[in-house]
């Protein structure tokens, strides 16, 4: 009896694992084995596929074959007993295109009201993703074990901290990877659960803010108790993107080590241009808090988000305000290469009733003013980037008198 060729061959590639599955064509024939050949693009000859010769089951693994994952490959299969079936050819494919991202490896760290998630690719030193290692982003689903209400967090990197959790509560999560450059979404990791600890005696510092004064940065935060000492650390923000189980080398800000106030001042030249993460910790000598939430700090935006400079042209019923670039020390204008929104506050000099205008344009009309009346104006700039969400301080108020009633044109 002629052996029939196997049918419905499926190629599954997850990370560096290459798995073939197929259907037997004739279940009634026993002791049949199966063998595969492969052929690379531009080659005429077929080569035996190691790991997939004389297989008795309907599944084989050819991960040991060192393939160029960007090169097209063709496979064929046949059944063998005393004789052999004809070859069945599988549609050619490119391993990289076909590959799925496997489940990432996840480690969890618990605090009282936070969980740190360390994520690394499931396959160490993967050949498939060798050129894309730095491009992985992750997303996760987290829920309280008791409620099951899920929250999704997108676009995170290899270290992510989730805050504002409840103490002594079990949280569960699963993580998947994505390579947005290749439109690939990975497989979820197994579910990992961890219980947050009992509430710590000392809470972490809160509401950390950075501002610029003269040539210094001023870092301020809030704290519940008095007579504490604080320390501040920084980390390059890009390091969070590093793949694998990275060592995060948080560094001390020397002027912010063991400070006894809820602020510290340090020179701008402590930081080169870049984006940093900052965190603060409190101690009373016996106990130490967990670290505060990490805030993102962009030196360019911090240093250069100075209050806008503006000129007022006074008419009888309005002001025309022309907003210019703020001046650095030395009177040179600051080039701002990110979009800003301007908030303009104005009020009658004799009143406290303030009115507000929000404008993207740099020439703004303040309408509905009374003639021959003194109005004061102040302005500040906001970045339009939601993530950075920074504001300058207000400019000094400038007061001008409107013209008499017939000069509106």
């Amino acid at each position: 009896k002629n052996l029939k060729s196997p049918q419905k061959v499926e190629v599954d590639i997850i990370d560096d694992n290459f798995i073939l599955r197929w259907n037997r064509s004739d279940e009634s024939v026993g002791n049949v084995t199966f063998s595969f050949d492969y052929q690379k693009t531009g080659m005429d000859n077929w080569i035996k596929l190691s790991g997939c010769q004389n297989i008795t089951s309907t599944k084989c693994n050819f991960s040991s074959l060192k393939l160029n994952v960007y090169e097209e490959i063709k496979l064929r299969i046949r059944a063998e007993k005393e004789n052999t079936s004809s070859w069945y050819e599988v549609d050619s494919f490119t391993p990289f295109r076909k590959a799925q991202i496997g489940p990432p490896e996840v480690h969890l760290e618990a605090e009282d009201k936070a969980i740190v998630i360390h994520i690394s690719p499931g396959t160490k030193d993967s050949v498939m993703w060798a050129l894309d290692g730095l491009s992985f982003t992750y997303s996760l689903v987290i829920w309280k074990n008791s409620s099951g209400v899920e929250e999704r967090i997108e676009n995170i990197y290899s270290r992510h901290k989730i805050y504002k959790l409840s103490p002594e509560t079990t949280y569960c999560l699963k993580v998947k990877a994505a390579l947005l450059t290749s439109w690939k979404i990975g497989v979820y990791s197994p579910v990992h659960c961890i219980k947050t600890t009992v509430e710590n005696e000392l809470p972490p510092p809160e509401n950390i803010e950075v501002s610029v004064q003269n040539q210094n940065y001023v870092l301020k935060w809030d704290y519940t108790y008095a007579n504490m000492t604080f320390q501040v650390q920084w980390l390059h923000a890009f390091l969070k993107r590093n793949p694998g189980n990275h060592l995060y080398k948080w560094k001390q800000i020397p002027d912010c080590e063991n400070v006894k106030t809820t602020q510290c001042v340090f020179p701008q030249n402590v930081f080169q241009k870049g984006i940093y993460l900052l965190r603060v910790q409190a101690s009373d000598g016996n106990n130490t808090s967990f670290w505060s939430e990490e805030i993102k700090f962009d030196t360019e935006i911090q240093a250069f988000l100075l209050p806008p400079v503006f000129n007022i042209r006074s008419l009888s019923d309005s002001f025309h305000i022309y907003i210019g670039a703020p001046k650095q020390s030395g009177n040179t204008p600051v080039i701002q290469d990110y979009p800003l929104i301007y908030e303009i506050i104005f009020w009658e000099n004799t009143s406290n009733a303030e009115r507000k205008i929000i404008e993207k344009k740099t020439d703004v009309t303040v309408p509905n003013l009374k003639p021959l009346t003194v109005y004061c104006v102040k302005a500040r700039a906001h970045t339009m980037d939601e993530k950075l969400n920074k504001s300058s301080v207000f400019s000094d108020a400038v007061c001008e008198k409107t013209k008499p009633g017939n000069t509106s044109k």
């Epitope: 480690h107 969890l108 760290e109 618990a110 605090e111 009282d112 360390h118 270290r159 961890i194 600890t197 009992v198 710590n200 005696e201 189980n245 990275h246 060592l247 995060y248 080398k249 560094k251 001390q252 016996n286 106990n287 130490t288 967990f290």
Partner: antibody, heavy 119, light 107 residues
Framework: EVQLQQSGAELVKPGASVKLSCTSS????????MHWVKQRTEQGLEWIGR????????KYAPKFQGKATITADTSSNTAYLQLNSLTSEDTAVYYC????????????WGQGTSVTVSS | DIVMTQSQKFMSTSVGDRVSVTCKAS??????VAWYQQKPGQSPKAVIY???YRHRGVPARFTGSGSGTDFTLTISNVQSEDLAEYFC?????????FGGGTKLEIK
């Protein structure tokens, strides 16, 4: 393969100083923190301090401030522990160890260097 | 400094038994706790990190648990090669501190 090779045993006189070395292979010490730990005979482990070889930043346990100085030479992939004003209390085995990931405290240890302080 | 207390200096067990070594921190250290095994005449070897994760190559009979201030290293189905001293360590806050150690003796 990660390995930490420590210098040989030392017999030193009270009041003198000694400098121990820990040479690493299989990884770059710049990417790690290098720690030193003391263990006296039949006693527990005491953390002395650590260095970030990338920039030389150090942290010490208060007890060893002034007693120990940790340095590193990235060109030879070596960390050092110098102990000053030695007394019999400093007689111990000293281990170097590396921290290679934020997940771990330390993941690899050297074989230890025995220091004996005796006149 | 955070004090790590291993209340039992010695523990006696038999091959095949299950034994639990405990460690208490003087303040909340989250899950930043490691366990080390030190056999006689050898340097310490990492067994557990982040309170509950096994280092590569460590047999599955070793499990770590706990968070906050109370931590446990459990060895199920104790083998003769587990004869050693076990140390806990917190790495949440500098200076890092070790427990005093628990010597496991095989009957």
């Amino acid at each position: 393969e990660v390995q930490l090779q420590q210098s040989g045993a030392e017999l030193v006189k009270p009041g003198a100083s000694v400098k121990l070395s820990c040479t690493s292979s299989g990884f770059n010490i710049k990417d790690s923190y290098m720690h030193w730990v003391k263990q006296r005979t039949e006693q527990g482990l005491e953390w002395i301090g650590r260095i970030d070889p990338e920039d030389g930043e150090t942290k010490y346990a208060p007890k060893f401030q002034g007693k120990a100085t940790i340095t590193a030479d990235t060109s030879s992939n070596t960390a050092y522990l110098q102990l000053n004003s030695l007394t019999s209390e400093d007689t111990a085995v000293y281990y170097c160890a590396r921290r290679g990931s934020s997940l771990y405290a330390v993941d690899y240890w050297g074989q230890g260097t025995s220091v004996t302080v005796s006149s | 400094d955070i004090v790590m207390t291993q209340s039992q200096k010695f523990m006696s067990t038999s091959v095949g038994d299950r034994v639990s070594v405990t460690c208490k921190a003087s303040q909340n250290v989250g899950t930043s706790v490691a366990w080390y095994q030190q056999k006689p005449g050898q340097s310490p070897k990492a067994v557990i990190y982040l309170a509950s994760y096994r280092h590569r190559g460590v047999p599955a009979r070793f499990t770590g648990s706990g968070s906050g201030t109370d931590f446990t290293l459990t060895i199920s189905n104790v083998q003769s090669e587990d004869l050693a001293e076990y140390f806990c360590q917190q790495f949440n806050i500098y200076p890092w501190t070790f427990g005093g150690g628990t010597k496991l003796e095989i009957k």
